[in-house]
């Protein structure tokens, strides 16, 4: 199925316009902003979601140290160019002809340049580290319960294959979720870790992208997990290219 037939809505993407104009009168949904048809049985790509968002009215130390090459999305929102499959185009430019190269999750990985800037390929983000700080609770969460519930969340809510959730680390109050997915590992039909991470990020912020859902209620043995801060680090298959000027 592509969308909920009874009332013609897209369960996995509320930022769509749906109508029964598909083959045989079937419900078909198109993303706001781009007008591209989306598959409502899976997650919509982050590129199309960002475009739609821009078109809408406005103990032993187990924690991971992000690599020196890890990227954080400091640039925030922009209106991206998406390819016909809904992926980010390697080169993004704004209305003032300032251009930059992005990775597969749409995060800038080079200095900004002009229209002469070349981005030869879309570099894949193969490792995502989601760093959360939860609100203080009566006691620490049980690590294995937390691990199981987060894996269940990514498997069932975001439809991400369990093999792509590499690890869940916990050192109260910090939780880290590691997602890993190489180009060679990602089969046709697999949810992209970048898309799963984006849906999770929006859920955690109380901005669920799912149709008709008020927000994420994540519980560990009945206790709500309340996230106070979220940081997401992106690691690309090829390290980013920034000038020394930016690093100092």
């Amino acid at each position: 199925h592509t969308a909920a037939q009874d009332n013609c809505t897209c369960p996995t993407n509320k930022m769509t316009v749906c109508s029964p104009d598909g083959p045989g009168g079937r419900c078909q949904c198109r993303a706001l902003g781009s007008g591209m048809a989306v598959d409502c049985s899976t997650l919509t790509s982050k590129c199309l979601l960002l475009k739609a968002r821009m078109s809408a009215p406005k103990n032993a130390r187990t924690l991971v140290r992000p690599s020196e090459h890890a990227l954080v999305d400091n640039d925030g929102l922009y209106d991206p160019d998406c390819d016909p499959e809904g992926r980010f185009k390697a080169r993004q430019c704004n209305q003032t002809s300032v251009c930059w190269c992005v990775n597969s999750v749409g995060v800038r990985r080079t200095d900004k340049g002009d229209l002469s800037l070349r981005c030869d390929e879309l570099v894949r983000t193969h490792h995502i580290l989601i760093d959360l700080r939860h609100r203080p609770t009566a006691g620490a969460f049980n690590h294995s319960d937390l691990d199981a519930e987060l894996r269940r969340l990514f498997r069932e809510r975001y439809r991400l294959h369990p093999k792509f959730v590499a690890a869940v680390h916990y050192e109260q109050p910090t939780i880290q979720i590691e997602l890993r997915q190489n180009t060679s590992q990602k089969a046709a039909g697999d949810v992209d870790i970048g898309d799963a991470a984006y849906y999770f990020e929006r859920d955690i912020k109380g901005e669920s992208l799912f149709q008709g859902r008020g927000g994420l209620d994540l519980r560990v043995r009945g206790e709500p997990l309340q996230v106070e801060r979220t940081l997401i680090y992106y690691l690309d298959e090829i390290p980013p290219k920034f000038s020394m000027k930016r690093l100092t």
């Epitope: 969340l153 109380g206 927000g215 994420l216 209620d217 009945g222």
Partner: antibody, heavy 119, light 112 residues
Framework: QVQLKQSGPGLVAPSQSLSITCTVS????????VNWIRQPPGKGLEWLGV???????NYNSALMSRLSISKDNSKSQVFLKMNSLQTDDTGMYYC?????????????WGQGTLVTVSA | DIQMTQSPSSLAVSAGEKVTMSCKSS????????????LAWYQQKPGQSPKLLIS???SRESGVPDRFTGSGSGTDFTLTISSVQAEDLAVYYC????????FGGGTKLELK
């Protein structure tokens, strides 16, 4: 479609135990939690306990010593057992599904089992 | 344990009237991260199982008439029925899910 059907004895003798089964259809017990709620005649709703999708349980602290909730995922059944019943345990007993990560709201309820504690 | 207090316990109204009922919790039900409140409203008609009306304090469930509105945040919540219909006569319960679950004592809506 989502359904919860309850079965269990209507009459229980004082000091005996109560067992009610909630058989679900239209969803999996590995994806959704099931709660138990009761309502004495003419009174309000009281939450008893929950069996979470992952298999863990929580109970109303005032009744914890007398309650036990279990499940059989393969048979799509959740079981409530309550010991040492007294006359003030008389009432309607409901099972209800929570909405998983969309909130611990009880959007689907069983039809209720009327339990009378009497000699 | 979180206590939930509803008032009034009963309310006699005429059809077409606007009605408000209150629910107060003994501690805040607000998730500061998502800015959402762990509060629901249920309607129970005589001889029936309860029905979920409002989740997250203000999100109306599918199929619930828009005359029902939930509002409030933190510890103080309100259910408003803008123009009461005969079929709205029931008992209304609030429920917190911030720390497991607790129902309020209920507000009974009766015809004058």
């Amino acid at each position: 479609q989502v359904q919860l059907k309850q079965s269990g004895p209507g009459l229980v003798a004082p000091s005996q135990s109560l067992s009610i089964t909630c058989t679900v259809s239209g969803f999996s017990l590995t994806s959704y939690g099931v709660n138990w709620i009761r309502q004495p005649p003419g009174k309000g709703l009281e939450w008893l306990g929950v069996m979470w999708a992952g298999g863990s349980t929580n109970y109303n602290s005032a009744l914890m010593s007398r309650l036990s909730i279990s499940k059989d995922n393969s048979k799509s059944q959740v079981f409530l057992k309550m010991n040492s019943l007294q006359t003030d345990d008389t009432g309607m007993y409901y099972c209800a599904r929570d909405e998983n990560w969309d909130g611990a709201w009880f959007a689907y309820w069983g039809q209720g089992t009327l339990v009378t504690v009497s000699a | 344990d979180i206590q939930m207090t509803q008032s009034p316990s009963s309310l006699a109204v005429s059809a077409g009237e606007k009605v408000t009922m209150s629910c107060k919790s003994s501690q805040s039900l607000l998730n500061s991260g998502t800015r959402k409140n762990y509060l629901a409203w249920y309607q129970q008609k005589p001889g029936q199982s309860p029905k979920l009306l409002i989740s997250w304090a203000s999100s109306r469930e599918s199929g619930v008439p828009d005359r029902f509105t939930g509002s409030g945040s933190g510890t103080d919540f309100t259910l408003t029925i803008s123009s009461v219909q005969a079929e709205d006569l029931a008992v209304y319960y609030c429920k917190q899910s911030y720390n497991l679950f607790t129902f309020g004592g209920g507000t009974k809506l009766e015809l004058k």
